[in-house]
Interface confidence: medium
């Protein structure tokens, strides 16, 4: 997959990190771990994971995501008390229901984005994914009530294939190639557009090759990829213009793609 | 009994697509109680697991972060297999290469095994 | 990810022996753990399923024990087919994990 020029923007932002070694690149050391740790990304301004062998390395490492951010993200524990107080719903709200893998039956509630409420499910005991609730009310205080949410939206198509649902990263891919994210556009975590703008570009499972666009939230701009003719995401526009349109100022809403089942 | 055979190259050159392919005999890719993965082993890392599709009236995957940006699991139900595709590979992708089935995490059937070489 | 950390790394042990393997979860996995043992040139094959599940057809000499992170393959009575490299994974959270793996030699 060719990306235009102009897609991929990367050059150093001016922001300042609070320590020097938050500027060092990530470095897994000589040894042969595999450690999950965190580290500063000068480029994208966020914390990331990389994973790290064991020993050497530098300081530019972090066992915890919060740990990372505290240390190098300017204000970052201003905002973490606003985000905790309810301005923000977190990503793993927007993940599909995961039964898991096991076969236990357990009542659990998870937060759904069609109806825009948290609802029962049943979970097998095992695996799944963060959108998974002991009791409504954790559910709706996480999930459904957050004090400054996105505004509702009512034409969402939920994906036929669910991608990755442990885990919601702040990197974005294009059929599995990792896209540069440029500094000077809003985080991730910024973002206060529609849920399915976030998505990763997902190719879908059949055999077409299709011209689409899709946002990346991380560089503001819509990135061409192929998609496959069904399955996929909603973070699917046949055009770019319909694709900054609906995500860059939500003036349209998502069209379906005729997904074929 | 269920069986899986794997099939793909055992010879892949840095910066190019490793694919590999697990046939299954006796269940089904979309039987809503098995799981399908993908492990590899090396002598450097030993049993790694990379990621699984499940289907469960829908299909889902996950996949491990250290690969996570260069992996796709695919189902294809048509022939009654799985697909796995680790884009832009490097020598440290040389292992012996295993699918296997499991009903949860328990992976009880296994492929032969495909060694892949990563090498120009 | 959840660390998995066998004990010992390798051993010597001779026919008739009783043999013990510990596996150390770096977080509790309650009883989401499984042994496999594998023999060179040959795939793992599944022992043990949930810590103390015996898989059909596997000896009963062969038994788990554990809960929470730590973790026990006993073979009572070791067999010249025995001799092999033993792995525990837990499958409490994503990623699946290993252990390193203990290989067990004739004395």
């Known amino acids: 997959l060719s990306e235009e020029a102009d897609d991929t923007d990367s050059e150093l932002g001016s922001m300042k990190p609070l320590h020097t070694f938050c500027a060092m690149k990530a470095d897994d050391g000589p040894c042969k771990a595999m450690i999950r740790s965190y580290f500063f990304n000068m480029y994208t301004h966020q914390c990331e994971e990389f994973i790290y062998g064991g020993c050497e390395g530098n300081e530019n490492r972090f066992d915890t995501l919060e740990e990372c951010k505290k240390t190098c993200i300017p204000g970052y524990e201003k905002t973490a008390v606003k985000a905790a107080s309810g301005a923000e719903r977190p990503d793993f709200c927007f993940l599909e229901e995961d039964p898991g893998l096991c076969r236990g039956y357990m009542k659990r509630y998870l937060y759904n984005n069609q109806t825009k409420q948290c609802e029962r499910f049943v979970y097998g005991g095992c695996l799944g994914n963060r959108n998974n609730f002991e009791t409504l009310d954790e559910c709706k205080k996480i999930c459904e009530n957050p004090v400054h949410s996105p505004s509702p939206v009512n034409e969402v198509q939920m994906s036929d294939y669910v991608t990755d649902g442990n885990t919601v990263t702040d990197r974005s891919t294009v059929n599995n190639i990792v896209v540069p994210q440029s500094p000077k556009v809003p985080r991730r975590r910024d973002y206060r557009g529609r849920p399915w703008c976030l998505q990763p570009a997902d190719s879908g499972l059949c055999k077409a090759s299709e011209r689409r666009f899709y946002y990346n939230s991380a560089t503001g701009k819509c990135h061409r990829f192929n998609y496959t003719g069904c399955g996929g995401n909603n973070n699917n526009f046949t055009t770019r213009r319909r694709c900054l349109r609906s995500c860059k100022t939500g003036l349209i809403k998502n069209k379906s793609k005729g997904v074929v089942k | 009994q269920v069986q899986l055979q794997q099939s793909g190259p055992g010879l892949v050159k840095p910066s190019q697509t490793l694919s590999l392919t697990c046939a299954i005999s006796?269940?089904?890719?979309?039987?809503?109680?098995?799981?399908w993965s993908w492990i590899r082993q090396s002598p450097g890392r030993g049993l790694e697991w990379l990621g699984m599709?499940?289907?469960?009236?829908?299909?889902?995957?996950h996949y491990a972060v250290s690969v996570k940006s260069r992996i796709t699991i695919n189902p294809d139900t048509s022939k009654n297999q799985f697909s796995l595709q680790l884009n832009s590979v490097t020598p440290e992708d040389t292992a012996v290469y295993y699918c296997?089935?499991?009903?949860?995490?328990?992976?009880?059937?296994w492929g032969q095994g495909t060694l892949v070489t990563v090498s120009s | 990810d959840i660390q998995m950390t066998q004990s010992p790394s390798s051993l010597s042990a001779s026919v008739g022996d009783r043999v013990t393997i510990t596996c150390r979860a770096s977080?509790?996995?309650?009883?989401?753990l499984n042994w496999y043992q594998q023999k060179p040139g040959k795939a793992p094959k599944l022992l043990i399923y949930?810590?103390?599940n015996l898989q059909s057809g596997v000896p009963s000499r062969f038994s788990g024990s554990g809960s929470g992170t730590d973790f026990t393959l006993t073979i009572s009575s070791l067999q010249p087919e025995d001799f092999a490299v033993y792995y525990c994974?837990?499958?409490?959270?994503?990623?699946?994990?290993f252990g390193q793996g203990t290989k067990v030699e004739i004395k």
């Open positions: 296997a089935r499991g009903g949860s995490g328990v992976m009880d059937v």
């Open positions: 006796g269940d089904s890719v979309s039987s809503s109680s098995a799981a």
């Open positions: 599709i499940y289907y469960r009236s829908k299909w889902y995957n």
């Open positions: 977080q509790s996995i309650t009883n989401y």
């Open positions: 949930d810590v103390s």
């Open positions: 994974q837990q499958y409490s959270g994503y990623p699946l994990t």
